[in-house]
């Protein structure tokens, strides 16, 4: 019996088609993805093949103005329109708190939303009961398939799930649910979840009875053969893991941003064993037409976004200096504003010993593309912020050793004076450079804000200590020559859309007046 699994993950609000790098579509003939194009391909496969499931492995929320404005209603609407069969909760589904998940998505979705390792307690338990499930048994043709969900247990550090949701260890939580499915005579089981490729592989290895793992969170691109675009495969598709009980378990993920549709064909025997698995992600490029009815619906929903872009978010009473003449040479107040917003967006008081789990921010000066003039009545709009941060990136959480941070700050000024983009703006860091010294030895003082303290203060950076840092995904991926970050990072979790982080901060503060205050000397 053959099952076709179509899957997406980490779509992050890319409802409209995007450019090849998943930023805003400029030249339509070269654009990719989007729900209208996805629907065309899904329907094509549904018509051609008998047993098809369309699954999403989480993080539909967060990433473009679509989420900023519609707050998840757009996810429910368009996923319903595409007739998704199931979705796993990702960490970003909690970005607007539990209410921001329940009202727009859980109550509106016509498909099951799953996570076995999230347990509700207190008053939330009854409120959320039945709105998400640990597993769902789906009829497919003449067979049944069990889908069991899971979500990163790091979610409390990455998002805003509140205090009434407990995130358990994935493997510990999944095993009893899979065992329950087995007692219900469900012998074909897919683990669908959002904990990253390493955890996906562990689930395949450790959870008895899981036949296939469909994952997300790590934006992993897998491919067999010559890849069709710029993404470099992390392994073959599917990636085969040998389970502890000797089975070959296919593990898949489909990169991110709706650029690809994962396509996996699984052959099951009478006992529900996987006899064979093959496929590849399908690049959703312009050779696939956008479905006209979904496209028309997108255009209808788009109108509200254009209006939102010009509305006032807040005011500035000072010039926000985002000029390259400042931000690529010295501390600039636009850099300070953005870093302060980045830290503010990551306030999570999850431990009494820590005032916060992260205190540091770094930001490449070259990523700041425009100033904002306060003489326009001080008004700041989304449109203004889009000029400052035009690349559609995210502000991510990484864990780095002190020694890696030291290398990064040396790189920041290794060719100082040439107006290059790698000059770092900071938050929660005091750095002193001596530019008369030779490159690679210019950082003379590097103090960082403590986290395990009730009164935050600056202490010297320790080379062997592991620090959490918020930074642009561009830097996490080694951009602007920061190869040491990419090579040496110990953990990387993708965060919120850059403009959204700054806009939320400005809306919260109402009036801003960032200063140049001696963070960089």
């Amino acid at each position: 019996w053959e099952l076709t699994i179509l899957h997406t993950n980490d779509v992050h609000s890319r409802l409209e088609q995007t450019s090849e790098d998943s930023s805003k579509c400029v030249n339509a003939s070269r654009c990719m993805g989007g729900v209208a194009r996805l629907f065309t391909k899904v329907q094509q496969i549904r018509r051609a093949e008998p047993n098809v499931l369309l699954l999403d492995a989480g993080d539909q929320y967060q990433g473009t103005i679509w989420f900023t404005v519609y707050k998840g209603a757009e996810v429910a609407h368009f996923m319903n329109a595409l007739r998704y069969d199931a979705m796993a909760l990702g960490n970003h589904e909690f970005d607007n708190g539990v209410e921001g998940l329940i009202e727009p998505l859980l109550k509106e979705a016509k498909f099951p939303i799953l996570s076995a390792n999230i347990k509700a307690k207190g008053p939330l338990a009854s409120q959320i009961s039945g709105l998400y499930l640990p597993y769902k048994v789906l009829p497919v043709g003449d067979e049944v398939v069990g889908i069991v969900g899971y979500t990163s247990k790091e979610t409390p550090f990455l998002s805003n799930p509140g205090t009434n949701l407990v995130f358990e260890d994935e493997i510990t939580a999944l095993q009893p649910e899979v065992d329950k499915l087995k007692t219900l005579n469900v012998n074909k089981i897919i683990a669908l979840g959002h904990s990253g490729f390493e955890m996906d592989k562990l689930i395949a290895q450790k959870v008895r009875g899981v036949d296939v793992v469909v994952g997300g969170h790590s934006n992993t691109f897998l491919y067999t053969g010559n890849p069709p675009s710029k993404e470099v495969p992390a392994g073959k598709y599917p990636f085969i893991v040998t389970s502890d009980d000797g089975r070959k378990v296919p593990v898949v993920q489909a990169y991110a941003f709706g650029k690809y549709l994962g396509y996996l064909k699984i052959e099951f025997d009478e006992r529900g064993n996987v006899i064979s698995s093959h496929g590849n992600p399908i690049l959703l490029n312009s050779s696939i037409p956008e479905d006209p009815s979904i496209k028309a619906d997108i255009n209808k929903w788009r109108i509200k976004l254009d209006n939102y872009s010009t509305q006032e978010l807040g005011k500035t009473i000072v010039y926000l200096d985002g000029s390259s003449q400042s931000c690529r040479f010295r501390e600039c107040n636009m850099g300070n504003l953005i870093c302060d917003a980045m830290i503010n967006n990551n306030l999570r008081h999850t431990d009494e010993m820590f005032w916060n789990h992260v205190s540091m921010c770094i930001l490449n000066g070259g990523g700041i593309r425009s100033p904002i003039d306060e003489r326009n009545n001080g008004t700041i709009t989304w449109e203004n912020l889009a000029a400052v941060l035009p690349f559609g990136g995210t502000f991510d959480l990484v864990q780095l050793k002190g020694s890696t941070l030291k290398k990064a700050f040396e790189h920041s000024v290794h060719r100082y004076g040439q107006s290059t983009g790698e000059f770092l703006q900071v938050g929660g860091i005091h750095v002193v450079y001596d530019l008369s010294r030779k490159p690679g030895d210019r950082v003379v003082k590097l103090d960082v804000l403590c986290t395990k303290c009730r009164v935050p203060s600056y202490d010297p950076l320790k080379m062997d200590e592991v620090y959490k840092v918020i930074l642009p995904n561009f830097l996490a991926n080694g951009g602007d020559g920061f190869q040491m970050i990419k090579d040496e990072l110990l953990r990387h979790d993708s965060g919120d859309q850059d403009i959204n982080v700054v806009s939320t901060y400005i809306s919260k503060m109402k009036v801003i007046y960032p200063a140049v205050e001696g963070r960089i000397k």
Partner: antibody, heavy 113, light 106 residues
Framework: EVTLKESGPVLVKPTETLTLTCTVS????????IQWVRQPPGKLLEWLGV???????DYNAAFISRLTISKDTSKSQVVLTMTNMDPVDTATYYC???????WGQGTLVTVSS | DIQMTQSPSSLSASVGDRVTITCRAS??????LNWLQQKPGGAIKRLIY???SLDSGVPSRFSGSGSGTEYTLTISSLQPEDFATYYC????????FGGGTKVEIK
């Protein structure tokens, strides 16, 4: 639990027709095929034929003229019919799942006058 | 038709021995190979499917490997209950079996 059980006569006279039934439980004949295999005493396993989930059948070329495999999906039963039986057809007859994950216990059919 | 050549046809071994049985296909069968165990009573049980995946309840001392036309069943440490006849079965085309390997007590 997934099981297969063969039933039918233990003794068949030469030139007669053998009819064996394989009763399936734990999976659907709409989704999976059934294979038939036989093993003469002390000899090797020999594939006879298969009926697929869609209802079509394939046969070992050596038996194509005298073998028919059919099914009644509603009863979860598959029937093997072999005409013109000969003493050399004496064997244990097995039905098995399409992928060989499950086997019947086998039924010994003796062809003798 | 795809032919399966299995060797050896029989072997004598002691408890604790490592046993290897091989099957060669007349053409590439792309991992579509099962290993079956038949006990003296006639009952047939699949041990390994898709070349190397272990069936539920089968001890981990059994393992399978191979690709293309060459396939191997290994019993890492022979146990008393393992004395039986083993067959390879290809299902890339119409089923064909290897000639069997009878594993006897030395």
């Amino acid at each position: 639990e997934v099981t297969l059980k063969e039933s039918g006569p233990v003794l068949v006279k030469p030139t007669e027709t053998l009819t064996l039934t394989c009763t399936v439980s734990g999976f659907s004949l709409k989704s999976y095929g059934i294979q038939w295999v036989r093993q003469p005493p002390g000899k090797l396993l020999e594939w006879l034929g298969v009926i697929w989930s869609g209802g079509s059948a394939d046969y070992n070329a050596a038996f194509i003229s005298r073998l028919t495999i059919s099914k009644d999906t509603s009863k979860s039963q598959v029937v093997l019919t072999m005409t013109n039986m000969d003493p050399v057809d004496t064997a244990t007859y097995y039905c098995a799942g399409q992928y060989g994950s499950v086997w019947g216990q086998g039924t010994l059919v003796t062809v003798s006058s | 038709d795809i032919q399966m050549t299995q060797s050896p046809s029989s072997l004598s071994a002691s408890v604790g021995d490592r046993v290897t049985i091989t099957c060669r296909a007349s053409q590439d069968i792309g991992d579509r190979l099962n290993w079956l165990q038949q006990k003296p009573g006639g009952a047939i049980k699949r041990l390994i499917y898709a070349t190397s995946s272990l069936d539920s309840g089968v001890p981990s001392r059994f393992s399978g490997s191979g690709s293309g036309t060459e396939y191997t069943l290994t019993i890492s440490s022979l146990q008393p209950e393992d004395f039986a006849t083993y067959y390879c079965l290809q299902y890339a085309g119409s089923w064909t079996f290897g000639g069997g390997t009878k594993v006897e007590i030395k």
